[in-house]
Amino acid sequence: IFPLAFFIYVPMNEQIVIGRLDEDIILPSSFERGSEVVIHWKYQDSYKVHSYYKGSDHLESQDPRYANRTSLFYNEIQNGNASLFFRRVSLLDEGIYTCYVGTAIQVITNKVVLKVGVFLTPVMKYEKRNTNSFLICSVLSVYPRPIITWKMDNTPISENNMEETGSLDSFSINSPLNITGSNSSYECTIENSLLKQTWTGRWTMKDGLHKMQSEHVSLSCQPVNDYFSPNQDFKVTWSRMKSGTFSVLAYYLSSSQNTIINESRFSWNKELINQSDFSMNLMDLNLSDSGEYLCNISSDEYTLLTIHTVHVEPSQETASHN
């Protein structure tokens, strides 16, 4: 989905390369073609990252942290390519890299600044704690510290609790919001400014539905066009809240177009799914079907949560029997 890395050109032979944690990147360096090519990559002017001369690598004094993680584009060296292929970058790899390239004609040095970002896909969760309802936007691993903003009915809200845990190389962040008794829609945005990546979570509460036992109910779930891109992989999950925890009724994976149904009374309309409408039907309702139903549409860039409250009441017949 994402490029190997992206370069920002800045003056004075210095480039900024932005990479993602645990992914491979390229530190770019080019030179004027010439014979007797010598390439030395160093980190912070001290640690030997990679050395090449006399037609082969010389890694005897390579710093151990770079072992088996670096290589050059050997077939392109004679064309003036001294770029370094760097495997599995970590946050400890951030810093300034100097590429020294010498030939029989000239010697040049290029500086490359490596910045590493982390953005494991965030999640928006809906939780009940005793009598309170919470929305929680969380990201398990992110670096640098992200910007988290909340909106209620499209209006920014200042209340923004952040529970932050720092590990060796990234942050884990939870941002809970108490939405008890609210019928508003909520939106949470998490932005990683370094990776220029934004994720949005949106929560919508639908009007409560009152149904009689044995009837069926249709619950709507249609993505908001602002976020939804059918070309991007996403997952749709329908769940039911029972005694404080959600149990999955069914889910749909866009990549395989697979639908998995765990509740025999649940039905999905294939034609509607093809039109990106994930509304569902639940047949033959019984009293224990009362509760909250959650539709979760999630991709790498968004989570859309839609909540329906269903009240199933005894039918007249059942009532008269009792």
Partner: antibody, heavy 120, light 107 residues
Framework: QVQLVESGGGVVQPGRSLRLSCAAS????????MHWVRQVPGKGLEWVAV????????DYADSVKGRFTISRDNSKNTLYLQMNSLRVEDTAVYYC?????????????WGQGTLVTVSS | DIQMTQSPSSLSASVGDRVTITCRAS??????LAWYQQKPGKVPKLLIY???TLQSGVPSRFSGSGSGTDFTLTISSLQPEDVATYYC?????????FGPGTKVDIK
Amino acid sequence: QVQLVESGGGVVQPGRSLRLSCAASGFTFSNYGMHWVRQVPGKGLEWVAVIWYEGSEKDYADSVKGRFTISRDNSKNTLYLQMNSLRVEDTAVYYCAKDLISGIYYVDHWGQGTLVTVSS
Amino acid sequence: DIQMTQSPSSLSASVGDRVTITCRASQGISNYLAWYQQKPGKVPKLLIYAASTLQSGVPSRFSGSGSGTDFTLTISSLQPEDVATYYCQKYNSAPFTFGPGTKVDIK
């Protein structure tokens, strides 16, 4: 143009020390490896030592290993050769020389040399 | 360490003669060999590197060949100004040993 000027030579007794300097100009000193090569008057060339462009790697001829130390100060564009425990057989003209590239190739420019005489 | 030998140690030839100097390494050094010329009372000057590549400004009558352990320096037509001592040097890895030199003069 490349200029290398050695200094610090002279007469010294066996067992004593001497430090040679080489002032470089006309090129980006910090980009190039540097060598010391010596020559007994009327005899052949003997390679003595090399230092890489940034000073990280050094190598020596067996005949001087443990007694001579090559170093450089890139901010002063100067190469040094610290010679300790001098012997009579160290008597020679000492040339400062520029490597083609980083310190792993041949010499493409030479200084005029400075004479070191070790004698009791 | 690899030893470098040169032959002959000295030679006399007439102006216009073709002169060949041999340099031998005790182990293979690929083509990492340079040739220098040192005229009497002067500092050495680079003639050839990578066994056969002529340094810029060096007359084309000088040429080099060889690879591995055996190398030659050839002066196709000896000139009076070529009177000098010629040294080979290996640079595949340190120590960057010189050969003992070949002294060339005019008959």
